[in-house]
């Protein structure tokens, strides 16, 4: 009978190890061993026993020992285990972004390792065990599926092999992969909402905001907002899960008519897109035209409103018949058309929409000078030491000056308070002189003397 | 000065109906006309309008769905495929005026038809 | 767009009592607002244009008032005739996609 010891041995891959031979009677004819793995004899030996050193055990292997006795010949196997860690274990990678609620498939690989039976792989969130598989087939793949919550953005997710030789070898070999992070998003089915004038004038600024709900991680969303071919320069405001892109923009005589304005919020892979329609016009504020802004009085005047074509103007409230860009009327210039306002008002329908301007111009009327009764009374009588105000007011335009004169020397005291004396007594002659010409007219004090009893 | 709308009878969902509006005593060039509608027990609908010029516009519900047109003294509202809920009573009324005050022209339906009933049943 | 609301949507007043009915815009309309009020079988009747304008033929128990976004209709001793729904309706634009009425206000007179 031929023993062996030990019958069977763990070892690391590469390892050395011991194998004693020996037989069951005291004197064999032969003793040795068979194997293909290096061997050396360690010396001495017994009479019915060798040692074996056998070195740079790289696989599993089955060495046997052998004797020949007078009884007979027989042999005995040592079992030889290699274990070794696997050279790579590897976290396919992940999705650059991956959509909240959406599953997502982990998957590892694992070259190498022995024994296989004592070999598990398992997949990790942290350090949280989400799945655990034996290790099968060369390379070994191991798959999992979890669902993805907004919870898991920024998780880390990797690979550990645990090769678990106990209690033959009172150590449990681990090897993990690089950790992987994950990052979700949310973008909601619905679209951004857009905010912004349906019309807009030439070389004006209108404010355009887009906003959106329900996004996460709202920090990495993108907003693009442009206007036909305008890319538009937002500031963004975020809220918790909420963003808001507000642009000002300011539209030029080219990009005139009807110009699609774009809304697109960008997360992880995904876009939402909301467009709308803005009309881009051109309303210059109407001409109000006066055939001369400065005529004499009895001066035929045309006061002419003219605005875009497509626009509908009133003139001093009046609509134009038909209605129309152009109103236009005539009339005779009086004294009273002097400083007379002309309001041309148009509007102007844009998409549905109206728009209103207007322009305001004056009326000049050049009349007088004039010297009425009502204004400066021809005669005035006044109680000697009352007091008085002599008046006398000179009308036209230009205002004309006004010299009241006695004997072309003495001056009336217009617009003064006097005490009337003996002195203001007389014939004035009142002198109004403008540009235009002049008139005069003549005025006369009496002072009435005081009665006495 | 009148507004007087026709055509609203029974018809079976997808037959095509065109709704006129008459006008009398004013001119269709200078004015906008609006169609308005009202479902039995509900609030008025505004459905679109036409210019003085002939532009139309829409509420967006009913784009597609319904075509406005005019000639010198009637409008038309067509509904291109009937539903039962087009069901309602159609109002045509004039959408145009102005305020001498500002000098400016606005929206405001100032004249409406008595309204002629539209009855969308299989 | 120009979104209309309308409230109270429904309001129950006393003969001679007063009612208040108010119109909100989403954005500013100046003063091209109306108010119409309807009768069963009826078309709608405008009774107030220009935000406070009396229209020709309408007591003067109706007064309209606001400018901007907010809007309000007041109908002080209400009579058994008053008994209507209420819109009120935005004369600013009539573009592609617009509201232009409110929602209504029946007013029911005990």
């Known amino acids: 009978q031929t023993s062996v010891f030990p019958p069977e041995v763990i070892l690391p891959r590469g390892g050395s190890v011991k194998v004693n031979c020996s037989a069951s009677c005291d004197q064999p004819i032969s003793l040795g061993m068979e194997t293909p793995l290096p061997k050396k004899e360690i010396l001495p030996g017994g009479n019915n026993w060798k040692m074996y050193e056998l070195s740079n055990v790289q696989e599993d292997s089955q060495p046997m020992c052998y004797s020949n006795c007078p009884d007979g010949q027989s042999s005995a196997k040592t079992l030889l285990t290699v274990y070794w860690t696997p050279e790579r274990v590897e976290l396919a990678p992940l999705p650059p972004w991956q959509p909240v609620g959406k599953n997502l498939t982990l998957r590892c690989q694992v070259e190498g390792g022995a024994p296989r039976a004592n070999l598990t792989v398992m997949l990790l969130r942290g350090e949280k065990e989400l799945s655990r598989q034996s290790a099968v087939g060369e390379p070994a793949e191991v798959t999992t599926t979890v669902p993805v919550g907004r919870d898991d953005h920024g998780a880390n997710f990797s690979c550990r092999t645990e090769l678990d030789l106990r209690p033959y070898v009172l150590k449990l070999f681990e090897n993990t992969s690089a950790p992987h992070q994950l990052q979700t998003f949310d973008l909601p089915a619905t679209p951004p909402q857009l905010v912004s004038p349906q019309v807009l004038e030439v070389d004006t600024q209108g404010t355009v905001v887009c906003s959106l709900d329900g996004l996460f991680p709202v920090s990495e969303a993108q907003v693009s907002l442009a206007l036909g071919d305008q890319k538009l320069n937002p500031t963004i405001t975020y809220g918790n899960n909420s963003l808001s892109a507000k642009a000002s923009v300011k539209v030029t005589a080219e990009e005139e008519g009807t110009q699609q304005l774009l809304c697109g919020v960008m997360l992880g892979n995904q876009t939402q897109e909301t467009r709308q329609t803005v009309t881009i016009y051109s309303f210059p504020a109407p001409n109000v035209n006066l055939t001369k802004p400065e005529v004499s009085e009895g001066t035929e005047v045309i006061v002419e409103c003219e605005a875009h074509p497509r626009a509908k103007v009133m003139l001093n409230g009046v609509p134009a018949q038909p209605p129309g860009p152009r109103a236009q009327f005539l009339l005779k210039a009086t004294p009273e058309d002097n400083g007379r306002s002309f309001s041309c008002s148009a509007t102007l329908e844009v998409a549905g929409q109206l728009v209103h301007k207007n322009q305001t111009r004056e009326l000049r009327v050049l009349y007088g000078p004039r010297l009425d009764e009502k204004d400066c009374p021809g005669n005035w009588t006044w109680p000697e030491n009352s007091q008085q105000t002599p008046m006398c007011q000179a009308w036209g335009n230009p205002l004309p000056q006004l010299k009241c004169l006695k004997d072309g020397t003495f001056p009336l005291p217009i617009g003064q308070s006097v005490t009337v004396t003996r002195d203001l007594e007389g014939t004035y002659l009142c002198q109004a002189r403008s540009t235009r010409g002049e008139v005069t007219r003549e005025v006369t004090v009496n002072v009435l003397s005081p009665r006495y009893e | 000065q009148s507004v007087e709308e026709s055509g609203g009878r029974l018809v079976t969902p997808g037959t095509p109906l065109t709704l006129t509006c008459t006008v009398s005593?004013?001119?269709?060039?200078?004015?906008?006309m609006s169609w308005v509608r009202q479902a039995p027990g509900k609030g008025l609908e505004w459905i679109g309008i036409i210019s003085d010029s002939g532009s139309t516009y829409y509420a967006s519900w009913a784009k597609g769905r319904f075509t406005i047109s005019k000639t010198s003294t009637t409008v038309d509202l067509s509904i291109t495929s009937p539903t039962t809920e087009d069901t309602a009573t159609y109002f045509c009324?004039?959408?145009?005026?102005?305020?001498?005050?500002?000098?400016?022209?606005?929206?405001?339906?100032?004249?409406w038809g008595p309204g002629t009933l539209v009855t969308v049943s299989a | 767009a120009y979104d209309m609301t309308q409230t109270p949507a429904s309001v129950e007043v006393a003969v001679g009592g007063t009612v208040t009915i108010k119109c909100q815009a989403s954005q500013s309309i100046n003063s091209w607002l109306s108010w119409f009020h309807q009768k069963p079988g009826q078309p709608p009747k405008r009774l107030i244009y220009k935000a406070s304008t009396l229209a020709s033929g309408v007591s003067s128990r109706f007064k309209g008032s606001g400018s901007g976004t907010q809007f309000t209709l007041t109908i002080s001793g209400v009579e058994s005739a008053d008994a209507a729904t209420y819109y009120c309706?935005?004369?600013?634009?009539?573009?592609?996609?617009?509201?232009?009425f409110g929602g209504g206000t029946e007013v029911v007179v005990k």
């Open positions: 005593g004013f001119s269709l060039s200078n004015y906008y």
């Open positions: 309706q935005q004369g600013y634009s009539r573009s592609d996609g617009e509201h232009v």
């Open positions: 009324a004039r959408d145009w005026s102005y305020d001498s005050t500002s000098g400016y022209y606005y929206y405001d339906m100032d004249l």
